[in-house]
Interface confidence: low
């Protein structure tokens, strides 16, 4: 057959979905590598086809739109599964075509088990409260398409096993899961199940997304340089090794970068030609603010080193800080014979 | 920053129509549930009723008193609510005000007053 | 005649602790939350305290919230001047299907 435009096994978009389950796929041709949509692709008589393969196989095969009760379909540019069974599992390509163009795309589609509680292998979003931020609010992911507006679905929240009902500071309004007040207690897992009938049968979907609370933005502060600070100086004799650690407390802030960096005589390390090591470590709070530190070393240090200027550089979006380092030349101690003797009047 | 702002109020005789707009911003109106709260003059707050989003099927539930003669609606294309009050009478007189939440009311608008009187 | 029950008057001095109560049954605070507003003369009301003994931000902590059973009641510490102003109980109520409030209390600072 003629030449095929093949963007390859497009693994960046692994697809997970549960057995026994609806699930609607897009191809993703036209929400990631082409510049026009289906309707486009259709209106100039270009034709979508389906097909895949099995997990464990190499053949690629058609995919059957002719099995009971329509089980898998196409619709437009989205193959749909209602339900889903675990051996559906595989890659599925869709390649648009005409006689004289082609494009395809394969992607790996993974038939999730998930047990009573709703524990799985399914990689769960995570969504992050502000804690005690006033009302914040999830909502019920990825369960547009599924059923026409005219449909009055039924939504029933959990965390981990149990049912939400009459809890503290969560409460259920349909597809929103509303916090009163997010407290360190309400991380977990949230699912909620989605329950509408079509043509005579009755579907669920499940979705399960991790809440994560995290510091609120009314407690954020600039970066807290713990040290160095003015009641430690590091005192060194040359030949020695000089350690000094930066250690930054950050508040958490969505979307923040936080930089923690050294400059020698207002040069970062890389622009010197001495020979500096930098390590640096970072541990979190509960609520994801962050501690940074950044050990500065120089296995044998100069005298010329130690006259240097050793700044500790912070920044995030709450603002920039900086601290130097009190480093100097340790005084050798007295020598009996000439300097003490010298004290005495000796001559 | 949330706010809510109704508009529409006025003077009307009984049996009367009137439409009520509530225009919200700073929040992602389509996925909110949006109540109205009612207050006749010198008198308590009264729930009039309160419409669940799109997504959770976009129902509407009413206060006995209302049920019937007031419409609640919302336009998320404009991140605006409404309430068609038909058939007035004059105990419907109050200030109406447009509410965020279906349970915990937590932004209020500063109200539109209705005024029902021949 | 409103389905929660709030005495229609409360007064208290500056610097007093006053409390003020909200009856109902099973099917409204029994089983749900319960909100607290405040309205100050010739405003909008403002929630107050939520599910319980929630602040929204900005509320001071001489606010509080309780529950037990069929009952709430909020508690003002450290009266204020500026705490006089109309107090409102809200839940959802079951069987009615809908909001319902208290009559409201009045609270005079003295």
């Known amino acids: 057959s003629e030449r095929c435009d093949d963007w390859g096994l497009d693994t960046m978009r692994q697809i997970q979905v549960f057995e026994d389950e609806p699930a609607r796929i897009k191809c993703p041709l036209f929400e990631h590598f082409l510049k026009f949509n289906y309707s486009t692709a259709h209106s100039a008589g270009l034709t979508l086809i389906w097909y895949w393969t099995r997990q464990d196989r190499d053949l690629e095969e058609p995919i059957n739109f002719r099995l009971p009760e329509n089980r898998i379909s196409k619709e437009k540019d989205v193959l749909w599964f209602r339900p889903t069974l675990l051996n559906d599992t595989g890659n599925y390509t869709c390649m648009l075509r005409n006689t004289t163009y082609c494009s395809k795309v394969a992607f790996p589609l993974e038939v999730v088990q998930k047990d009573s509680c709703f524990n799985s292998p399914m990689k769960l979003p995570v969504h992050k409260l502000y804690i005690e931020y006033g009302i914040q609010r999830i909502t019920c992911p990825n369960v547009d398409g599924y059923f026409p507006s005219s449909v009055k679905p039924t939504i029933t929240w959990y965390m981990g096993c149990y049912k939400i009902q009459n809890f503290n500071n969560v409460i259920p309004e349909g597809m929103n899961l509303s916090f009163l007040i997010a407290l360190i207690s309400n991380n977990g897992n949230y699912t909620c199940v989605v329950t509408y009938p079509e043509n005579g049968r009755t579907f669920h979907l499940t979705r399960t997304l991790t809440v994560k609370v995290v510091g609120s933005p009314k407690n954020a502060v600039p970066p807290v340089i713990h040290s160095p600070n003015d009641h430690v100086v590091y005192e060194k004799e040359p030949g020695e090794e000089l350690l000094i650690p930066c250690t930054v407390y950050f508040s958490f802030l969505m979307d923040s970068r936080n930089e923690v960096w050294w400059t020698i005589d207002g040069k970062k390390p890389d622009d010197i030609t001495i020979d500096v090591t930098i390590n640096e470590s970072i541990s979190h709070s509960r609520t994801e603010d962050e501690t940074r530190t950044q050990i500065l070393s120089i296995k044998k240090v100069t005298s010329e080193d130690l006259k240097r200027s050793y700044v500790c550089h912070a920044r995030s979006a709450k603002g920039e800080v900086a601290k130097a380092a009190k480093v100097k030349q340790k005084v050798p101690a007295p020598r009996y014979t000439v300097e003490l003797a010298c004290g005495f009047g000796a001559t | 920053e949330v706010q809510v702002v109704e508009s529409g109020g006025g003077l009307v005789k009984p049996g009367g129509s009137l439409r009520l707009s509530c225009a919200a911003s700073?929040?992602?109106?389509?996925?909110?549930?949006m109540s109205w709260v009612r207050q006749a003059p010198g008198k308590g707050l009264e729930w009039v009723g309160r419409?669940?989003?799109?997504?959770?099927?976009?129902?509407?539930d009413y206060a006995a008193p209302v049920k019937g003669r007031f419409t609640i609606s919302r336009d998320d294309s404009k991140n605006t609510l409404y309430l068609q009050m038909n058939s007035l009478k004059t105990e419907d007189t109050a200030v109406y005000y447009c509410?965020?939440?279906?349970?915990?009311?937590?932004?209020w608008g500063q109200g539109a007053l209705v005024t029902v009187s021949s | 005649q409103s389905v929660l029950t709030q005495p229609p008057s409360a007064s208290g001095t500056p610097g007093q602790r006053v409390t003020i109560s909200c009856s109902g049954n099973?099917?409204?605070?029994?089983?749900?939350?319960v909100n607290w507003f405040q309205q100050l003369p010739g405003t909008a009301p403002k929630l107050l305290i939520y599910?319980?003994?929630q602040r929204p931000s900005g509320v001071p902590d001489r606010f509080s919230g309780s529950k037990s059973g069929t009952s709430a009641s909020l508690a003002i510490s450290g009266l204020q001047s500026e705490d006089e102003a109309d107090y409102y109980c809200?839940?959802?109520?079951?069987?009615?299907?809908?909001?319902?409030f208290g009559g409201g209390t009045k609270l005079t600072v003295l």
């Open positions: 509410t965020t939440g279906g349970y915990v009311f937590d932004y």
């Open positions: 700073g929040f992602i109106f389509s996925k909110a549930w």
């Open positions: 419409i669940k989003s799109k997504t959770d099927g976009g129902t509407t």
């Open positions: 099973n099917s409204n605070i029994g089983s749900y939350i």
């Open positions: 599910s319980k003994n």
């Open positions: 809200a839940a959802w109520d079951d069987s009615l299907n809908g909001v319902v």
